[in-house]
Interface confidence: low
Amino acid sequence: GWVWNQFFVPEEMNTTSHHIGQLRSDLDNGNNSFQYKLLGAGAGSTFIIDERTGDIYAIQKLDREERSLYILRAQVIDIATGRAVEPESEFVIKVSDINDNEPKFLDEPYEAIVPEMSPEGTLVIQVTASDADDPSSGNNARLLYSLLQGQPYFSVEPTTGVIRISSKMDRELQDEYWVIIQAKDMIGQPGALSGTTSVLIKLSDVNDNKPIFKESLYRLTVSESAPTGTSIGTIMAYDNDIGENAEMDYSIEEDDSQTFDIITNHETQEGIVILKKKVDFEHQNHYGIRAKVKNHHVPEQLMKYHTEASTTFIKIQVEDVDEP
């Protein structure tokens, strides 16, 4: 019968002939009376056999990622008679893996959005690298993820590639971060190959800033002839947040005379001071009122940022009009 062991050839061998093993018949007594032949895909081009001994050699560099096994056929013939000594037999040559492929991130570019001020541990995004090497061959395709850039704000789980927040971030200071993740095979051991990817992490706004008046004192004037409903001027607050988090409502905090009102222009986010009751220069020629400003939408959990509303003082001078 046929005698052989399992055949393996390492991929990417640089030698011009690599001995893989020997195929032989147990009837072969070593007197060179038998001839061995190799048939099938790769016979004669990738693999050759020593016709006398049955020794098999690989004569080309192989790439496991291109082809991981070869199925060949062997024959042994008695030279004197030309007859087959053994029935033709099929055998397999397996290409064994070496760590010649670096991990690759196939889904890049990565981009994620996470709310500012998110607590430590908040999941941002998961990045995944793939390695073309053999996952069943040692650690060639076992990956470990690490953070090359992004400390101290982000961390990555070494085995999953899950990126989490490790320090609170304030959008008003910096609104986006580039994080660079490295995937290393061989679980980081010597000879490891690595791949990197960049993740753009954008911070979405939360309402962590209250509106604050630009001025602590506004001076306005109103003619005593002005009818009720007249707009007599505008006041303005600024809010470092954006979008609906910067929408605000102005109101009167103090007006003993109950002469004025403030309405909010939601287009411009300005407060418009309105005359609620007609004024009379001869009766009172100036007024002092206090206005306050608050955000329109403040979720319960963000109320701590909005404890005391910003206020401003408005001095209103009444202009005299000649009366008949």
Epitope: E102, L148, Q149, G150, L173, W178, I180, S194, T196, S198
Partner: antibody
């Protein structure tokens, strides 16, 4: 907008030291690395080292180790590069360049350059 | 002698496509992002391509970058006279623990 403004040209004698400054504005100074790159007349670009303005950590190119010192002043958003034991081959334009948040990123903004001439 | 090898010069006529190569090793181009800089005569360098193939805003899409193994290249299509400049590749080198630049390529628009 981001701006890096460097100090003016210098003429130094061999053996002396030179200190070049680079004032940053338009961004959070402590969040970005700053590198120094030089270019000798008619030559290519050569990286000298990098400093992180937040902690002051530095990494210097092997070639300049022992001769270059990079420092920063966070109160004025300024980084400094001092090169000692000057020789004629140190005649070059010295650029500060903002390196991305960490070393693996690009230099996205550059100073206008400072010409240092070393001549006896 | 630069760690990254670039051709010293390249040329083309307006409208043509030119490619500038940058060859390195496993410790630099093989394992890190490649960046390209353009330096117009008498000015500071300007970022042209970052992280292998990304263009900063304001850089025309005529400029493109690519990387394969330990080599990178910069392609400029529809060449214009204002592209006449020096071009440098740059990458972080893990062995040297520092940035390395190519020797630069002087592009002439004929």
């Amino acid at each position: 907008q981001v701006q890096l403004v460097q100090s003016g040209a210098e003429v130094k004698k061999p053996g002396a030291s030179v200190k070049v400054s680079c004032k940053a504005s338009g961004y959070t100074f402590t969040s970005y690395y700053m590198s120094w790159v030089r270019q000798a007349p008619g030559q290519g670009l050569e990286w000298m080292g990098i400093i992180h303005p937040s902690g002051g950590d530095t990494t210097y190119a092997q070639k300049f180790q022992g001769r270059v010192t990079m420092t920063r002043d966070t109160s004025t958003s300024t980084v400094y590069m001092e090169l000692s034991s000057l020789r004629s081959e140190d005649t070059a334009v010295y650029y500060c360049a903002r390196g991305g948040i960490k070393l693996w990123l690009h230099f996205d903004y550059w100073g206008q350059g400072t010409l240092v001439t070393v001549s006896s | 002698q630069s760690v990254l090898t670039q051709p010293p010069s390249a040329s083309g006529t307006p409208g043509q496509r030119v490619t500038i190569s940058c060859s390195g090793s496993r410790s630099n181009i093989g394992s890190n992002f490649v960046n390209w800089y353009q330096q117009l005569p008498g000015t500071a360098p300007k970022l042209l391509i970052y992280t292998n193939n990304q263009r900063p805003s304001g850089v025309p899409d005529r400029f493109s970058g690519s990387k394969s193994g330990t080599s990178a290249s910069l392609a400029i299509s529809g060449l214009q006279s204002e592209d006449e400049a020096d071009y440098y590749c740059a990458v972080w080198d893990d062995s040297l623990n520092g940035w390395v630049f190519g020797g630069g390529t002087k592009l002439t628009v004929l």
